[in-house]
Structure formats: C-alpha cells, structure tokens
Interface confidence: low
Amino acid sequence: MNGRVDYLVTEEEINLTRGPSGLGFNIVGGTDQQYVSNDSGIYVSRIKENGAAALDGRLQEGDKILSVNGQDLKNLLHQDAVDLFRNAGYAVSLRVQHRLQVQNGPIGHRGEGDPSG
C-alpha cells in the first residue's frame, strides 16, 4: 500500500525589519495572476539570500501571506500586493500560512505530524 501525502497547515505571525534590499522575498499571486488554482492569494515565490526574511529564517518559499500589518491580502491585484509590501514601513508584521507536507504511513495507520516543527 502506498502512503498518502497530507498537509499540515499552520499560521504564524512573523515580524521582519526591512533591510537594505527590502524584506528579502518575492511574491506571486493575486486576482489577476492566480498562483494556485481557484486561489487568488499571495504566496512567497523566493527567499533572497542574506535578505531580511532569510536571516529571520521563519518565512518559507510556498508560504501564503494572509496579511501585512493587519491589512488583509484577499482579492488584491498582484501589483497592489507588491505596492502594499513596498509601502509597509520599516517594521513589518506578516500573518503567514505554512503548508507542511506530511508523509503518512499506509492508510489506516496514519502518522501524526508534529506541529511544533
């Protein structure tokens, strides 16, 4: 029997301090360029080496960003999301959704993913 791939979804508040090259990550998504089918959310596409996000270590490629400084990122055009990040200030609070892949055992013997990571 093959194992089944499940996902453990967790949310986290990440506070970043803007560095010389900004927040140090790229985003994809938005109502005009959906990254995930039927989801216009904003996702992290790349963490820049030695950038603010990389040095903090918590943000991961593939994470979904739910809000920036309390501002919901739902139903935004991609460019508006980009500008929201650019104008977010020096200290930036991100509400992030991590989607961790969990390889379970054979069906009927499901392993448990440890959310403490």
Epitope: L77, Q79, D80, L84
Partner: nanobody, 124 residues
Framework: QVQLVESGGKLVQAGGSLRLSCAVS??????MGWFRQAPGKEREFVAA????????VYADSVKGRVTISRDNAKNTVHLEMNSLKPEDTAVYYC????????????????????WGQGTQVTVS
C-alpha cells in the same frame, strides 16, 4: 500590466465644457490625479481624488470650474471642465498614485507612478 487610457480631449470654444475620461486597468485602490502640460511649460497638477472617492483636491487655477469624479465599479476617472479658457489648452494626463490606499491625496508629480499617454485639449 498597468494601463491608463485618457479620452475626451478635443478643440472647444472658450466658455465651453468638456468631459475627460480615464480608463484604468492593472491597479486599484489608488488615489487618481489629472495633470496637464501646455507647450513649453512644465507638467502641472489639476485635480485629484482619493481611492475611495470621498475627497478631492483642486489646483487654484481650476477651482470652481473643474470637477473630478470616479466610478470604481467601471475603473474610470472623469474630469468635468466648464467655463474653459484659452489658458486651459494643454495635454491632459491621467495618473495613478504609486501608493496603495494612500491616506492623503498628493498633488506632487513624484507620488504618481503610473501615467497615461495624454489627451489634447485646445480652447480657442
């Protein structure tokens, strides 16, 4: 891709009226402005409207003669111009604020990152 397309410019008699329109795509929730540039002169601020449409700002030179409005459902911004004078002759440009949901309307060219190609207004 951000696009601003102006329309409505034409030759009009002094004292006449005109309605300029700007179709916006690629950005939303932006303060929007109209600027103009007469031959041999610098581009100058005419009017601006907040992203929500609830506040407006006008240049002294057009106050009382010009009304800026927006239709967010149709992503358009309008500039209604009355009692036109020969000195209103210029290319009129629509512009979108570079800041997302900016709290305060700016009149400075530098705040407006996205520009249309312009529409010619000639008052004879």
């Amino acid at each position: 891709q951000v696009q601003l397309v102006e329309s409505g410019g034409k030759l009009v008699q002094a004292g006449g009226s005109l309605r300029l329109s700007c179709a916006v795509s690629g950005v939303s929730f932006r303060n929007m402005g109209w600027f103009r540039q007469a031959p041999g002169k610098e581009r100058e601020f005419v009017a601006a409207i907040s992203w929500s449409g609830d506040s407006t700002v006008y240049a002294d030179s057009v106050k009382g003669r010009v009304t800026i409005s927006r239709d967010n459902a149709k992503n358009t911004v309008h500039l209604e111009m009355n009692s036109l004078k020969p000195e209103d002759t210029a290319v009129y440009y629509c512009a979108a604020d570079g800041r997302f949901r900016a709290g305060r309307i700016g009149t400075s060219l530098g705040l407006y990152h996205y520009w249309g190609q312009g529409t010619q207004v000639t008052v004879s």
